[in-house]
Interface confidence: medium
């Protein structure tokens, strides 16, 4: 740099502001250097010396140019229903998102504070609106001529098969049973699955408990006196 170039700190002109990446120190009444991301102000500037910056310690960070005396603490480790999508470094906070089969019931500035398992639609109900990263599954009763015989957060109502001769008529939770050797037309013989909507980045997918198991206790939100949503299991 040229020999005569002035370095911070310097006194700004009256009515002027400090340059970008500098801040005005009220005590010194000087424009001083900010610390870069991953650092914090170890010693504030004076009229004759610039800000002294130091690296953030383990498990702390600063994301912006700053003059804070201490780095911010990274958030706590991700819970079992979450996946760490961004690690804690000197320049960024840890970010936790919900694992597949769960959605974010309580978000924070970045990532999720509280995950909840996606609602499962019980037999006789199908998925009307799939779950997203931040919203639960919406179930609806299967309309006449359709059925769902599964407890699932992805299965939609499927049309009954059409028989030449009906042995047992279908209902909302069961397909029609035909007497002839084969139906004239079968609509979607297998279960129709919607794509898993949440946190597909994770490779650590764990199977969601089936309704025959005990209700999950890994997530407890005060529900108040209202009953579970119609067509959903108690999960």
């Amino acid at each position: 740099l040229p020999a005569q170039v002035a370095f911070t700190p310097y006194a700004p002109e009256p009515g002027s502001t400090c340059r970008l990446r500098e801040y005005y120190d009220q005590t010194a009444q000087m424009c001083c250097s900010k610390c870069s991301p991953g650092q914090h102000a170890k010693v504030f500037c004076t009229k004759t010396s610039d800000t002294v910056c130091d690296s953030c310690e383990d498990s702390t960070y600063t994301q912006l140019w700053n003059w804070v005396p201490e780095c911010l603490s990274c958030g706590s480790r991700c819970s079992s229903d979450q996946v760490e999508t961004q690690a804690c470094t000197r320049e960024q906070n840890r970010i936790c998102t919900c694992r597949p089969g769960w959605y974010c019931a309580l978000s924070k500035q970045e990532g999720c504070r509280l995950c909840a398992p996606l609602r499962k639609c019980r037999p006789g109900f199908g998925v009307a609106r799939p779950g997203t990263e931040t919203s639960d599954v919406v179930c609806k009763p299967c309309a006449p001529g359709t059925f769902s015989n599964t407890t699932s957060s992805t299965d939609i109502c499927r049309p009954h098969q059409i028989c030449n001769v009906v042995a047992i008529p279908g209902n909302a939770s069961m397909d029609a049973v035909c007497t002839s050797t084969s139906p004239t037309r079968s609509m979607a013989p297998g279960a129709v699955h919607l794509p898993q909507p949440v946190s597909t980045r994770s490779q650590h997918t764990q199977p969601t408990p089936e309704p025959s198991t005990a209700p999950s206790t890994s997530f407890l939100l005060p529900m108040g006196p209202s009953p579970p949503a119609e067509g959903s299991t108690g999960d």
């Epitope: 740099l1 040229p2 170039v5 002027s16 970008l20």
Partner: antibody, heavy 123, light 107 residues
Amino acid sequence: QVQLQQSGAEVVRPGASVTLSCKASGYTFSDYEMHWVKQTPVHGLEWIGAIDPETGDTAYNQKFKDKARVTADKSSSTAYMELRSLTSEDSAVYYCTRDIHYYGSSLSYFDYWGQGTTLTVSS
Amino acid sequence: DIVMTQSQKFMSTSVGDRVSVTCKASQNVGTNVAWYQQKPGQSPKVMIYSASYRYSGAPDRFTGSGSGTDFTLTVNNVQSEDLAEYFCQQYKTYPYTFGGGTKLEIE
């Protein structure tokens, strides 16, 4: 090599708004401040304001603080300047220019300039 | 705001001559001054920074001098390609300000 590619000429009606863009290439966009300069035959070169793309921090010439708003998108290495409530006085060539500003020093000059965007405000 | 005054709007010179363009600041700006060259239809180009340091892309016939309030850009052995307008600029403090420009005309 460093290049600043500005959007094409604009002809707009008085009272309208316009957004000019400046796409940077050939260097790390967030490492350098981006400044905007207005040029007219009457007033010559006038500094409008600046943005630090790394932080989004901005600085403005008081004369333009209600007229201009500068932003930057790191993902596309593009700086933008919105000009509001346009009048014939805003007809000019607008340049984006990179500031060399050495961190921690007063050294600060414009080493690369865009080709300029001509703005015409006319009814 | 700091006012940068280039009192001569036009200067006439001949190829091979030496010419000096002056700029006066309304208050002390130290050496926080740059000089720019702008050819017709082109963007400005930096020639001098920190009052006296030649930018890497500028020919060595361009020199800068001065500090405080009075600054000079000198072009030695003027060439026809030096036909342009020259602007001084202070970067001591926001808002950065430019001089009104001096047009160099080749006789």
